[in-house]
Amino acid sequence: LIIGFGISGRHSITVTTVASAGNIGEDGILSCTFEPDIKLSDIVIQWLKEGVLGLVHEFKEGKDELSEQDEMFRGRTAVFADQVIVGNASLRLKNVQLTDAGTYKCYIITSKGKGNANLEYKTGAFSMPEVNVDYNASSETLRCEAPRWFPQPTVVWASQVDQGANFSEVSNTSFELNSENVTMKVVSVLYNVTINNTYSCMIENDIAKATGDIKVTESEIKRRSHLQLLNSKAS
């Protein structure tokens, strides 16, 4: 969480941002809140990006003002116009690109004053893994697949029964470049698995951590997976 204040001159207002991550090719949110004003027409929101000549987005007098928008953001940004009056200046960024990563500034002017806060935005690719029993293999084998990751993640296997065991010798991980030549498909195979055990396939890069669990018993197979974004710090 980053909390910024205005510095001098007119009164300062508190602006709060939260560091976040964007999944390339999908839509992302850059979060920013501020002390609200009673009149929408008195609120100016500007999003700036470090090193960029134009603006990322501007909202003033109750509507978007995009004459100064930088080319790299054209047609890809929107604020939640109906929520500005309650202090939400968050930016929706469509079709997140790898090059959208960087430091952003949420800058607010209201009748009460002005303030700003920076936000670190990471971009990459992350997806939920799915773990299945590989019935084509010669021995009991698990196959963990996740369709889109970037940068290249690490893959670690763990087991509930053999906690702390190192499975690197009995697993094999491969990364296959997807058609857009940026993201990669992750495939990891674990050999010599035992029945009545829960195995976890953990995929992690500096943006996200995802886990796929599988419990194999004689009578059934149970699966569970979850994904967590890393470094979501507020400012």
Partner: antibody
Amino acid sequence: EVQLVESGGGLVQPGGSLRLSCAASGFTFSSYAMHWVRQAPGKGLEWVSAISGSGGSTRYADSVKGRFTISRDNSKNTLYLQMNSLRAEDTAVYYCARGRWSKWGFDVWGQGTLVTVSS
Amino acid sequence: DIQMTQSPSSLSASVGDRVTITCQASQDISNYLNWYQQKPGKAPKLLIYDASNLETGVPSRFSGSGSGTDFTFTISSLQPEDIATYYCQQTDNFPYTFGQGTKVEIK
């Protein structure tokens, strides 16, 4: 220490060309938009050109559009200004300056390099 | 292009005096007004950005105010080292433009 050092200035005839360089050190060069600003002898400041941190966007003053080209090499931490079809009125000290945010001024400047266009 | 009109073009004041310089933009530039100090033979130095924000390391006797088209720069107590030319600059729209400068001298 954050530093910008210009070079490449000198005496050139009208119609001639010159390339100015600005070597940056002490900061992450690619994170900053960079600008060229000039000052004719005894006169005020005139903004000339700008380039985004990635090099993907450029802007020019009308007085130099079509004659000057701004560029950068982030691997060398260097900013350039290629000046063609030079005129007597281009005579000035040329400064490079950095701007982290598009609206918030130029916080670091070089010492300047003098360009004299005369026959 | 946005025209920036600075006044006065020069002034002479005593050490300790309050000095005020004004800058007027030909159209609304919101808060996008910066002030620079330039000493003879030196590069300009950023003092104030965003109309009223003091750049890191700049003495608190310097201040700025205003928004829209009318801006003011103030030195609350003039010091001998403040002898310089001061420029306003708009960064609302390209091309960024400067005022013509105000030369400050000591009486």
